[in-house]
């Protein structure tokens, strides 16, 4: 139990969460592909969620998806339509802290 407590203390002491780069606004054309990058780092490794216009992003097979990357997370939208425009936000948490960044897709 003592060693477990020490390990958890070390984890708490070294925990951090950083937004490494603000998300860019993107202006693109119909039918093209857009990528939004959420660049965060942290310990423990952060969990990242994506939102569009204040709501969780709906993934669509072969068209809209997001995945973890070495730098955080990437959201990709293929075959862009005017309906895709909006405010996109990534929210990252390491269990203790929360950081977020917003980009506009037009």
């Amino acid at each position: 139990p003592t060693s477990s407590w020490n390990i958890s203390s070390e984890l708490n002491k070294d925990s951090y969460l950083t937004l490494d780069e603000p998300m860019n606004n993107i202006t693109t054309s119909l039918g093209q592909t857009a990528e939004l990058h959420c660049k965060v780092s942290g310990n423990p490794p952060p969990t990242i969620r994506w939102f569009k216009n204040d709501a969780p992003v709906v993934q669509e097979p072969r068209r809209l998806s997001f995945r973890s990357t070495i730098y955080g997370s990437r959201l990709r939208i293929r075959n862009l339509d005017t309906t895709d425009t909006g405010y996109f936000q990534c929210v990252a948490t390491n269990g203790k802290e929360v950081v977020s960044s917003t980009g506009v897709l037009f």
Epitope: N25, T27, K52, N53, D54, A55, P56, V57, V58, T82, T83, D84, T85, G86, Y87, Q89, T102, V104, F106
Partner: antibody, heavy 120, light 107 residues
Amino acid sequence: EVQLVESGGGLVQPGGSLRLSCAASGFTFSSYGIHWVRQAPGKGLEWVAYIHSGIGYTIYADSVKGRFTISADTSKNTAYLQMNSLRAEDTAVYYCARTSSTSTSVMDYWGQGTLVTVSS
Amino acid sequence: DIQMTQSPSSLSASVGDRVTITCRASQSVSSAVAWYQQKPGKAPKLLIYSASSLYSGVPSRFSGSRSGTDFTLTISSLQPEDFATYYCQQTYWSPGTFGQGTKVEIK
């Protein structure tokens, strides 16, 4: 205090033109989108057009595309709706509304509206 | 286009009643639905956004909920000032599309 004030409505003949204005105050105009939404007498809300002046993005409802033009003058904090080739079915109260800071569609502040009547 | 089917189109209720208005989206809109109140001759006012978030200054008797693509606006105890027309709007897909409205009248 956020305020939106529309003006420019009135009676116009079919085929005529009108320009509506939406004067904004109390917020950083170029950081928010502005919608025009209309309401025909006794009917529901119909979205017309949207502009984000800070990015230069515009979009229109199919029913007005090619006839209406939305624009903005950031130095005057004012959005405009130029309406050409007006039809009887364009008769409505026209509202301008500001988007919230986290959504392109949620409209958190509205003007009082201006009435456009298209009739011969 | 995404359709928002609102029901009922009108209802009669008394002060103190619990009132429920529903809206169904024709496809997924996540939790991005807003509700507005409009009184005759006035502009709409935002009540709820993101399906269940109460807008600043709106009384707590108003609430919103989501079940899949079905969205509900509830007024827990109807007050005299609540007699109005209510509109839902999906705000996920741009531009937002409105429901046809529900008129809440005095019984």
